[in-house]
């Protein structure tokens, strides 16, 4: 049967027939920065070009893994996972390998930097199609390595990296912590985070998604027809590099932001058992397992959004946390969250010509997170409308008054240390959906956007009795752009988007006062773009044979037992 | 040993061509910072990536590297430029004593300096 990992990333509609794309990724070049590789292995022969780049430190032990097979083990396996004939994800992708890791699997930040520079220079000398760079390595947090990754990403290169195998916050490692890089954690056949003893996959807000990374069968450097299972976040990253190659081959014009949004969108949602992660990391860690899209056309019409968490603000009274979107994403809403519930809300503000989401800690608070909702909205013109705290007891309100602008998100920020829970909850007047309403002592910020064909609606779910979590989801075809709570009282810990669901968290019910004080409403703003839908339909009408679905349906490949190929 | 002698000759030449002192002192108020790996066993002291400000040209990177070598030589330290970066980040990779960090941070165009560290297969 098909190996579990390839089955897992295959869209459900193809699983029964075991379709495998015959030449997916053929327009894409994947650079691999790793150990040396056995390029004559039959899985990757003719698919991997070994560059003359080598920058590795001396082995610490004079004979450690000096036998070629062990020196080549890691890189050969990963090359096979990306593009191997039998066990590869993107069987059509061509690869180039750079040696930055020695026989012990050890390299340096400087060697990796020089390798990335080599790729950039190669790209300038001989521009090719889309480039994917796979970095199946990790070191401690490095400002310079992250900066180099950022520059390369801004030059149009897609970088995919391993989250790390330290059972730790991926933000403490590089290049995993670089925002521009697609950072991949590892899951097993049961969709559980990969564990090994006290270690295992990294997690946290710096991880973009997870992918198969345990007992992955692939090319073994022991012989040219050998296969072996390996485990680690490198294997997971190799799957995503392969998926990215497939997507880029089908749609070569995809930007990094578009690719990342699609990877997130087509992932399996909420299948990972979050109990494995430390409690404080669960909310920050994406519950996503990578998968190939069922097809690429039909995706274009969708309004894609993702949730970006900031770093923790720290506990000082005036501490703030900032969440940012990628350069070609729009910040459509901003929310905040604090485990202690002591926060002073959030606001959208301009920074360097771009909107950012800033959350404010409160006195006695343990710190806050800012949560940005980052979306792909071509030709968007967004602005923030602010209303200062109201004098009247009815509360503060602000709406989108410009013609053609729609409300995509609401934020509220207050200077007082505690809004208190004794004031009656504020209810939105009926028939005025295009406005944000909040506590009278808070300033309210409305995100108002104009984009071709953009339409939005407000969806609320109120619970009269105290409850630790209130959720409201957008319907099929609509995308969650905004998530906030009504009222913004002190027992509300905050609000955040998980996929297409708005989650409002409140303090433990046992610490909440009476039921009227415990009333919480989750407010979701759901949007869609008629313009994108139209454009996609036109594209589908004029294009044929270039989508992933066409590649999938082009050929059915049987999975052979490996030993059939040895003679 | 031959390598080092060659390097030292180069330094002497650099000494003659460089003006003494900091002709292009860093702009007032902008202090370059030093970074190193938080995980001690992964640190590689003695090798440093000197990152220059964004718009620094290759010629300026090379000049800054030579200046560091000249000023280090004046203090009796041997340094070795291992690589000059351009294309992604402006800067250079240098093998030198940690004693020279303070000096290096004061060089013109320097944005920050990072001590080299290990990365590992995952």
């Amino acid at each position: 049967s098909i190996p579990w990992n390839l089955e897992r990333i295959t869209p459900p509609r193809y699983r029964a027939d075991e379709y495998q794309p015959p030449d997916g990724g053929s327009l894409v070049e994947v650079y691999l920065l790793d150990t040396s590789i056995q390029s004559d292995h039959r899985e990757i022969e003719g698919r991997v070009m070994v560059t003359d780049f080598e920058n590795v430190p001396e082995e610490d032990g004079t004979r450690f893994h000096r036998q070629a097979s062990k020196c080549d083990s890691h890189g050969t396996h990963l090359a096979g996972v990306v593009s191997g004939r039998d066990a590869g994800v993107a069987k059509g992708a061509s690869m180039r390998s750079l040696r930055v890791l020695n026989c012990q699997g050890k390299g340096t930040v400087s060697g990796t930097l020089i390798g990335l520079e080599f790729i950039r220079k190669s790209q300038l000398v001989q521009p090719v199609g889309p480039l994917v760079v796979l970095l199946p390595l990790a070191g401690g947090y490095s400002r310079v390595l992250n900066a180099a990754c950022q520059r390369l990403a801004r030059a149009g290169v897609v970088l995919v990296t391993a989250a790390g195998n330290f059972r730790d916050d991926a933000c403490l490692y590089s290049p995993a912590s670089a925002p521009e890089v697609i950072t991949v954690g590892a899951t097993n056949a049961q969709d559980q985070p990969v564990t090994l003893g006290t270690l295992g996959t990294n997690f946290g807000r710096c991880v973009d998604l997870f992918a198969p990374g345990e007992d992955i069968i692939g090319a073994s450097s022991d012989c040219s027809t050998c296969f072996v299972s390996q485990s680690g976040t490198s294997q997971a990253a190799a799957h995503v590099a392969g998926i990215a190659a497939m997507m880029l081959s089908a749609e070569p014009e995809l930007t990094l932001a578009e690719l990342r949004q699609r990877l997130i969108h087509f992932s399996a949602k909420d299948v990972i058992n979050e109990a494995w992660f430390p409690e404080d990391q669960r909310v920050l860690t994406p519950n996503l397992v990578a998968a190939l899209p069922p097809s690429t056309h039909g995706a274009g019409w969708q309004l894609f959004c993702r949730t970006v968490w900031s770093a923790h603000s720290g506990p000082t009274r005036m501490a703030t946390a900032v969440a940012r979107c990628a350069p070609d994403e729009e910040l459509l809403s901003c929310s905040s969250f604090s485990r202690s519930g002591k926060r002073r809300g959030e606001r959208m503000e301009a920074q360097g010509g771009k909107l950012v989401c800033r959350a404010h800690n409160a006195f006695g608070g343990e710190g806050v997170y800012a949560i940005a909702r980052c979306c792909l909205l071509p030709q968007a013109n967004c602005s923030v409308h602010t209303a200062p705290p109201a004098e009247a007891s009815m509360g503060t309100r602000v709406h989108c008054h410009q013609q053609g602008h729609v409300l995509t998100g609401c934020s509220s920020h207050w200077e007082v240390e505690d809004l208190g829970t004794h004031k009656p909850p504020v209810l939105r007047p009926r028939g005025q959906p295009n406005q944000c309403v909040g506590h009278r002592e808070a300033s309210i910020h409305a995100s108002c956007c104009h984009a071709p064909g953009l339409e939005c609606k407000v969806k609320e779910h109120g619970i009269p009795a105290p409850q630790e979590q209130v959720t409201v989801a957008c319907e099929e075809g609509w995308t969650l752009t905004g998530c906030s709570a009504l009222p913004g009282t002190s027992h509300v810990l905050g609000a955040y988007a998980v996929d297409n669901t708005c989650v409002v968290r409140s303090r433990d019910v046992s610490t909440t006062g009476s039921t009227s004080e415990g009333a919480v409403t989750a407010v979701a703003i759901c949007c869609r773009s008629r313009h994108l839908a139209q454009a996609s339909q036109e594209l589908q009408g004029s294009t044929s044979g270039s989508g992933l679905n066409d590649i999938f349906e082009a050929q059915k490949i049987e999975w052979h037992e490996h030993h059939h190929h040895h003679h | 040993q031959e390598d080092e002698d060659g390097d030292y000759e180069e330094l002497v030449l650099a000494l003659r061509s460089e003006e003494d002192g900091l002709a292009e002192a860093p702009e007032h108020g902008t202090t370059a910072t030093f970074h190193r790996c938080a995980k001690d066993p992964w640190r590689l002291p003695g090798t440093y990536v000197v990152v220059l400000k964004e718009e620094t040209h290759l010629s300026q990177s090379e000049r800054t590297a030579r200046r560091l070598q000249a000023q280090a030589a004046r203090r009796g330290y041997l340094t070795k430029i291992l690589h000059v970066f351009h294309g992604l980040l402006p800067g250079f990779l240098v093998k030198m004593s940690g004693d020279l960090l303070e000096l290096a941070l004061k060089l013109p165009h320097v944005d920050y300096i990072e001590e080299d560290s290990s990365v590992f297969a995952q």
Epitope: P3, E59, D60, G61, T62, R63, F64, H65, R66, Q67, K70, S73, H74, H77, Q104, G105, N165, L196, D215, I217, S220, D222, C223, T225, C226, F227, V228, S229, Q230, S231, G232, S234, E561, H562, H563, H566 | F120, A121, Q122
Partner: antibody, heavy 121, light 107 residues
Framework: QVQLVQSGAEVKKPGASVKVSCKAS????????IHWVRQAPGQGLEWMGE????????KFNQKFKDRVTMTRDTSISTAYMELSRLRSDDTAVYYC??????????????WGQGTTVTVSS | DIVMTQSPSSLSASVGDRVTITCKAS??????VAWYQQKPGKSPKLLIY???NRYTGVPSRFSGSGSGTDFTLTISSLQPEDFATYFC?????????FGGGTKVEIK
């Protein structure tokens, strides 16, 4: 669960051969190298060699190179170790072990229960 | 071949004692060392891989350290079930070799 089950005890005469089997279950047999390790009575462990079941790839300790043969039958997920020209000092418990690769680490995570081979005239 | 010299070959200790076993490699093996526990009539069981990483399900009282040529296995507080023989193994280069073993007995 993942396990390796070995064949039963054997008594052999000097000069004869013995073939020990190791049946794998609970995982993809072709994905993991099988190593053979022996332990003479009251002694330490001695590595004999390895086979990668996805192929016929083998690697041996030079000490046994001329006398040992390692094979596998993927249809029944079983690895075999045959030792020929037996001598009395080959009397030992023979273990098979699965080698796992995680990140850039190698280790034996699962062992068979052992097969006692007695060589006596 | 790389020789792994383990010491002591046997030791007597009481429940609750801190026990340290050392292993010396004849040449640098970086951190390519594993430690196994073996009870009479049973097969070895993996405790530590890559010199210092505790394997799944192994109690936290077991720890490993070292790199290069000198390695240590420490049992912080000996429990009744820990009385067994312990082996180190290098997988730095072929042939893989084991230490002679350390038998931990009840005092």
């Amino acid at each position: 669960q993942v396990q390796l089950v070995q064949s039963g005890a054997e008594v052999k005469k000097p000069g004869a051969s013995v073939k020990v089997s190791c049946k794998a279950s609970g995982y993809t047999f072709t994905g993991y190298t099988i190593h053979w390790v022996r332990q003479a009575p009251g002694q330490g462990l001695e590595w004999m060699g390895e086979i990668l079941p996805s192929s016929t790839y083998t690697k041996f300790n030079q000490k046994f190179k001329d006398r040992v043969t390692m094979t596998r039958d993927t249809s029944i997920s079983t690895a075999y170790m045959e030792l020929s020209r037996l001598r009395s000092d080959d009397t030992a418990v023979y273990y098979c072990a699965r080698e796992r690769i995680y990140s850039n680490y190698w280790f034996f995570d699962v062992w068979g229960q052992g097969t006692t081979v007695t060589v006596s005239s | 071949d790389i020789v792994m010299t383990q010491s002591p070959s046997s030791l007597s200790a009481s429940v609750g004692d801190r026990v340290t076993i050392t292993c010396k490699a004849s040449q640098n093996v970086y951190t390519a060392v594993a430690w196994y526990q073996q009870k009479p009539g049973k097969s070895p069981k993996l405790l530590i891989y890559s010199a210092s990483n505790r394997y799944t399900g192994v109690p936290s009282r077991f720890s490993g350290s070292g790199s290069g040529t000198d390695f240590t296995l420490t049992i912080s507080s000996l429990q009744p079930e820990d009385f067994a023989t312990y082996f180190c193994q290098q997988y730095s280069s072929y042939p893989y070799t084991f230490g002679g073993g350390t038998k931990v007995e009840i005092k």
